[in-house]
């Protein structure tokens, strides 16, 4: 077999950070100050740091608070994302379908029919993987039909998310290798939904969404 799999390189999420974090993202300081009486008009023109007057008070943007938005918050509450995704770029070769120029056109009926059959086949292949979300065909090319596609995986955020996704990607590799080895043409006849070229399976790239709280904090600031 010449199935090729790349090594995945990802940056580990920092396990500790000085940024205050809680899942409900409740502000720790009030961001508005109400004003009553004649002096309010003067206050209106004095809102600082991008604050806007709403008729009663200065509405302060993120990072600022106080009557005139003159105070800077000392901490920002940020929480991790709810889910983390991984995208695997795979290539498989389908031998049970003859390539036509129409398959290059994603709007054509031929492409749509191929996409439906291929998607159904992959949903069966990966059905036992809880993290499996679906497949997205990016390109079809001659050979008979070389299918470049993405397999999307998703897991809830935990400190162990990388291990969960690493395990899921390994199972994807095992399952696609198995099906493309077993479902092959015999005497030019395919007795399965789709048949494959045993040697045409490749994993080009695996991208795992990185969660970096410090980067999130920089963006907010």
């Amino acid at each position: 077999r010449t199935t090729s799999f790349p090594t995945v390189t990802t940056t580990a999420v920092p396990t500790n950070t000085t940024i205050k974090s809680n899942p409900t993202s409740t502000p720790t300081v009030p961001r508005t100050t109400t004003c009553f009486g004649d002096g309010c008009q003067n206050t209106a023109s004095r809102c600082k740091n991008g604050g806007t007057w709403d008729g009663l008070k200065c509405q302060c943007p993120n990072l600022y608070y106080g009557e005139l938005c003159e105070e800077v918050v000392s901490s920002i509450d940020i929480g991790p994302p709810e889910t983390i995704s991984a995208q695997m770029e795979l290539t498989v070769t389908v031998t049970s379908v003859k390539f036509t120029e129409e398959l290059k056109n994603h709007s054509s009926q031929e492409f749509q029919e191929f996409k439906q059959t291929f998607t159904e086949q992959m949903n069966i292949v990966y059905s036992g993987i809880p993290e499996y979300v679906g497949v997205n065909i990016t390109k079809l090319r001659l050979g008979s039909v070389v299918v470049e596609h993405d397999v999307l995986l998703r897991t809830k955020y935990t400190p162990e998310y990388k291990t969960v996704l690493d395990n899921a990607t390994e199972v994807v590799k095992e399952k696609i290798t198995k099906v493309t080895t077993q479902q092959i043409m015999i005497n030019d006849i395919c007795s399965d939904m789709m048949c494959f070229n045993t040697t045409g399976t490749q994993v080009q790239n695996i991208t795992v969404t990185q969660y970096d709280p410090e980067e999130d904090c920089r963006k907010m600031a």
């Epitope: 929480g79 991790p80 998607t119 809880p130 993290e131 679906g134 998703r154 897991t155 955020y157």
Partner: antibody
């Protein structure tokens, strides 16, 4: 083996609150989501919300928003569902259920036995 | 919210025959070609039991008499052949979008 064991039946007066517990065993609740679903007598199933016990994230159905609170105690592998401002139409069997796998969206593969909550004056 | 409409509301089938329940969603429950539609069986006094997940995947331990099909907005649960023990309510459920929603249920009786 995977099990979800819920607290016993409750009878409450209108306006009161009820807190139902769901104790998990056979798996780590931090590794998945726990959902709550209710079923009024003779009626269908209604999703109330879910919690990610690893970080406390919750998502509630719009019909229950503001009245339901789902919490988790990972030290005891127990998830709680509290429903406040009870009315007679809240009389139902309340189920907790485990999400299939670590990702979502997904199905619910294991269910608690159900807790009957009766709201009556 | 995605509304799921099941039909028929009830059906009576003889043992050995085929039972077909359909579930139509008010909008697609598909992500990347994968349909997040699931089927449950519920017998009186019991919690629901997962039969089929993601439209067509058979849950572990569920007899192969049960099968699911469909994509996008139209889904089918088939029991073939039906057995006496299959008397129950059957529900479809989508998890493609919050809030998760269930169909109103289909009551299957064995003649």
């Amino acid at each position: 083996q995977v099990q979800l064991v819920q607290s016993g039946a409750e009878v409450k007066k209108p306006g009161a609150s009820v807190k139902v517990s769901c104790k998990a065993s056979g798996f780590n609740i931090k590794d998945t989501y726990i959902h709550w679903v209710r079923q009024a007598p003779g009626q269908g199933l209604e999703w109330m919300g879910r919690i990610d016990p690893a970080n406390g994230y919750t998502k509630y159905g719009p019909r229950f928003q503001g009245r339901v609170t789902i919490t988790a105690d990972t030290s005891t592998s127990t998830v709680y569902m509290e429903l406040s401002s009870l009315r007679s139409e809240d009389t139902a069997v309340y189920y907790c259920a485990r999400n299939y796998g670590t990702s979502y969206p997904n199905a619910m593969d294991y269910w608690g036995q159900g807790t009957l909550v009766t709201v009556s004056s | 919210d995605i509304v799921l409409t099941q039909s028929p509301a009830s059906l009576a089938v003889s043992p050995g025959q085929r039972a077909t329940i359909t579930c139509r969603a008010s909008e697609s429950v598909e992500t990347y070609g994968n349909s997040f539609m699931h089927w449950y069986q519920q017998k009186p006094g019991q919690p629901p039991k997962l039969l089929i997940y993601r439209a067509s995947s058979l849950e572990s331990g569920v007899p192969a008499r049960f099968s699911g099909s469909g994509s996008g907005t139209d889904f089918t649960l088939t029991i073939n052949p039906v057995e006496a023990d299959d008397t129950a309510n059957y529900y479809c459920q989508q998890s493609n979008e919050d809030p998760y929603t269930f169909g109103q249920g289909t009551k299957v009786e064995i003649k």
